[in-house]
Structures are given as structure tokens and as C-alpha cells.
């Protein structure tokens, strides 16, 4: 049952990277509008994106309140210009989203190599600690602040003249690796949350190579 000439939303999908979280759905509205509601399993429903003709709704502000909670959203369909109208059951048509737990499911954004510094046969590679939209005490937390030691980085490094990628891992944002003197190396990093079963890895950072401006070389 439902409102005449309205169709229920379908393909409700969470799109989330570093906790920036958007609910998407179909279809594009024809003579109808949507309102989204979100709640935790035990909480009350909160309405967002009132009477919108969009097919997405940014729910970041709600989920960052507690990223370890599990959330459920639902999308209501209303006839355009008659949003008070309800169906035969006295309720507008709606569809539920899959459950979503941000801490376990948000995609890890592409990391960035902040800098690298060579001192003799050692190179220190630093990964930028990306800011998220999660707040504590009115300040935005970094990815490391949120995930702590659950988050590791894998560094791939290789001689510019070779294809084989060596790896190193860290549960901080810094690597200290051994390199051959007089060789130029390239670097790429990947964020990983090993304890996860899905969305464990980020995409790789852009490749940075020695001899470019990001790095610093000190002969000692």
C-alpha cells in the first residue's frame, strides 16, 4: 500500500569515505519528493533532507555523533505538492536501508605521502594524518585519532630502476626503511584496517619518488 502515484525508493546504498557518509537511492523522482530518516538501533528517528528531489542525503552529521553505533535509515516517498497525503494505511510509502556501522564500514580514503627524508641509507616516510568530520570537544579528529592502532599503513617502495615492490608496515604514520646508497626510490602507501572483514584497504596514495620536491636528501 502507499500514496497514489508514488513509488517506493529502492537500491538504498551507503556511500562513506573517512566517515563522510551519504545515503543514495533510486529512482529519480517523477511527481514525488523524498524525506530521509535515520536512527540508531535503540534511538529515535531523526528526519533529514526534507521533501527533496535529490536521490541522495548527506547523513554525516548524524553518524559522526557515534561512529561505532549501527545506523538504519529509511526513505519516505510523497507526492509532489501534496506532502501531507498518506497512503491507505495512513503512512507514506517508505523503504529501509541496510544497516550501517561507520567504524566497521566507512571506506578508507586515499592516503597522501606528506614527506620523505633520506639520511644516509635510511629513509623516513611520513603519511599525512587526514582529518575526518568526527568531532571530539569541538575539534575534528584525524583518522589516527578515530582508529588508533586499528589503523595501519603499508608502504610499497621500489628502486626507480626496478619493478619489485618491497613492503613495510607501521601502526603510526611514519616508516623508517633501509635503502641502498645512491639509488632513487619510489613510494606509495595504503591504509589498512586488518581487523575488518570488508573495506580493509584504501586505494593507494599517489606515487612519490626521490628526486622530487616532496623529499629531502641528507648525505651524512
Amino acid at each position: 500500500s502507499g500514496t497514489t502515484n508514488t513509488v517506493a525508493a529502492y537500491n538504498l546504498t551507503w556511500k562513506s569515505t573517512n566517515f563522510k557518509t551519504i545515503l543514495e537511492w533510486e529512482p529519480k523522482p517523477v511527481n514525488q519528493v523524498y524525506t530521509v530518516q535515520i536512527s540508531t538501533k535503540s534511538g529515535d528517528w531523526k528526519s533529514k533532507c526534507f521533501y527533496t528531489t535529490d536521490t541522495e542525503c548527506d547523513l554525516t552529521d548524524e553518524i559522526v555523533k557515534d561512529v561505532k553505533q549501527t545506523y538504519l535509515a529509511r526513505v519516505f516517498s510523497y507526492p509532489a505538492g501534496n506532502v501531507e497525503s498518506t497512503g491507505s494505511a495512513g503512512e507514506p510509502l517508505y523503504e529501509n536501508s541496510p544497516e550501517f556501522t561507520p567504524y566497521l564500514e566507512t571506506n578508507l580514503g586515499q592516503p597522501t605521502i606528506q614527506s620523505f627524508e633520506q639520511v644516509g641509507t635510511k629513509v623516513n616516510v611520513t603519511v599525512e594524518d587526514e582529518r575526518t568530520l568526527v568531532r571530539r570537544n569541538n575539534t575534528f579528529l584525524s583518522l589516527r585519532d578515530v582508529f588508533g592502532k586499528d589503523l595501519i599503513y603499508t608502504l610499497y617502495y621500489w628502486k626507480s630502476s626496478s619493478s619489485g615492490k618491497k613492503t613495510a608496515k607501521t601502526n603510526t604514520n611514519e616508516f623508517l626503511i633501509d635503502v641502498d646508497k645512491g639509488e632513487n626510490y619510489c613510494f606509495s602507501v595504503q591504509a589498512v584496517i586488518p581487523s575488518r572483514t570488508v573495506n580493509r584497504k584504501s586505494t593507494d596514495s599517489p606515487v612519490e619518488c626521490m628526486g622530487q620536491e616532496k623529499g629531502e636528501f641528507r648525505e651524512i
Partner: antibody, heavy 120, light 107 residues
Framework: EVQLVESGGGLVQPGGSLRLSCAAS????????IHWVRQAPGKGLEWVGY????????YYADSVKGRFTISADTSKNTAYLQMNSLRAEDTAVYYC?????????????WGQGTLVTVSS | DIQMTQSPSSLSASVGDRVTITCRAS??????VAWYQQKPGKAPKLLIY???FLYSGVPSRFSGSRSGTDFTLTISSLQPEDFATYYC?????????FGQGTKVEIK
């Protein structure tokens, strides 16, 4: 249940080629790393190489570099070991193993192995 | 490459004995050492990770320790199912390398 199943082993002449497969189930290989490890008859374990199926990055032991190629097909959840220019000393049981990807845990699941015999 | 020198290469012991196997890394590998058990015709099984952590499902008679670049696997009271070959492996740097193995046989 996490499982790795190798196949494709057999008898091959020196200089020949063989492709081994490692079919994974119970997890998605793109979220992990896959390693190949071999064991010559009556000998110890020797690491062959790894692949990150998410980006195709690889690294090989010096003993196989330039002859062996590791690849992965994430749509089939399968990793491969292409072995060319085979030598008698490549005779071994070949295992694929999953790298859990943390700083602590390394190869947490192994396949049952497939025997490759290089002989004329 | 980092060498992992394992000793002894074999040992004979009786059920109930305390057994110790050692691995020495040729350079610092932090705690990035794992121990595996392998029985004839079977794949290796992970026993200990990060030098001293017991892998899920592994009996508590197995333990691991580290002292600098020396790593030890101890079986506190050898059981019949423990007769096997044991390998250490470092995964601190690429390529990861195995020790030569220690065969634990029945006395």
C-alpha cells in the same frame, strides 16, 4: 570458512612452463595479500613471492625473479603463479598462503599444496 | 636479505618433555617473527605470531619469546600430536625468510 585451494601442478620438462592457480573462498583476496611458498622434497620452506591483488604489486625471491610471475583475478577470487623456464631445482610442493596484513599476524591460512616436478 | 638461523635442526624428545627451539635473526626484526608447525604431507600451520602471541586455536602449551634478535619456541609438555617440523619466519622486511626447520622426533 577461509579456504585456499591450489591446482595446476604436474610433471614438466626443463625449460617448460606451468601455471598454478590458488582459488580462495571465505574471504575476498583484494582485501589481503597472497604469497607463494615452495618446499623441495625433504627440504625446508622457501618464500617465492607475493601479490597485492588490489593493485597488482608484486615482489619475488631472487631465485625465481624474471622466470615466475604472480597475478590475480579478483573477479574469480583467484591468484596465479606462472612459471617459465623451469629448472630441476624448481621441483617442489607449491603452497599459496594468505597474508592477514597486520603488523603482527602474517601467513594465517595456507592451501594444501600442489606438486610441481621438473624432469626430463 | 635477513637470515634466520634455526637450531637445532632436529631433536628427539619424549611425551611430556619440555622442548625449546631457537631462531636467530641476522639483524633486527623487531617482533615480526612467526612460528609454524608442519606435519608430513600437510601445509604449515601458524602457531605463534609477533614473537610471543598464541594464534587462535593453538594449545597453550606452545609459547614464544624474544630476546633481542633471538627468538624461542617452547612446548611446555610435548604431546603425541606435536611431533612435527617447526619453522620460524621473519616478516619484518621483504623478502620474508624462513629458518631451516627443526624436526621434533620421538625418542
Amino acid at each position: 570458512e577461509v579456504q585456499l585451494v591450489e591446482s595446476g601442478g604436474g610433471l614438466v620438462q626443463p625449460g617448460g612452463s606451468l601455471r598454478l592457480s590458488c582459488a580462495a573462498s571465505g574471504f575476498t583476496i583484494s582485501g589481503y595479500w597472497i604469497h607463494w611458498v615452495r618446499q623441495a622434497p625433504g627440504k625446508g620452506l622457501e618464500w617465492v613471492g607475493y601479490i597485492d591483488p588490489a593493485n597488482g604489486f608484486t615482489y619475488y625471491a631472487d631465485s625465481v625473479k624474471g622466470r615466475f610471475t604472480i597475478s590475480a583475478d579478483t573477479s574469480k577470487n583467484t591468484a596465479y603463479l606462472q612459471m617459465n623456464s623451469l629448472r630441476a631445482e624448481d621441483t617442489a610442493v607449491y603452497y599459496c598462503a594468505r597474508d592477514y596484513g597486520s603488523i603482527q599476524v602474517f601467513l594465517d591460512y595456507w592451501g594444501q599444496g600442489t606438486l610441481v616436478t621438473v624432469s626430463s | 636479505d635477513i637470515q634466520m638461523t634455526q637450531s637445532p635442526s632436529s631433536l628427539s624428545a619424549s611425551v611430556g618433555d619440555r622442548v625449546t627451539i631457537t631462531c636467530r635473526a641476522s639483524q633486527d626484526v623487531n617482533t615480526a617473527v612467526a612460528w609454524y608447525q608442519q606435519k608430513p604431507g600437510k601445509a604449515p600451520k601458524l602457531l605463534i605470531y609477533s614473537a610471543s602471541f598464541l594464534y587462535s586455536g593453538v594449545p597453550s602449551r606452545f609459547s614464544g619469546s624474544r630476546s633481542g634478535t633471538d627468538f624461542t619456541l617452547t612446548i611446555s609438555s610435548l604431546q603425541p600430536e606435536d611431533f612435527a617440523t617447526y619453522y620460524c619466519q621473519q616478516h619484518y622486511t621483504t623478502p620474508p625468510t624462513f629458518g631451516q626447520g627443526t624436526k621434533v622426533e620421538i625418542k
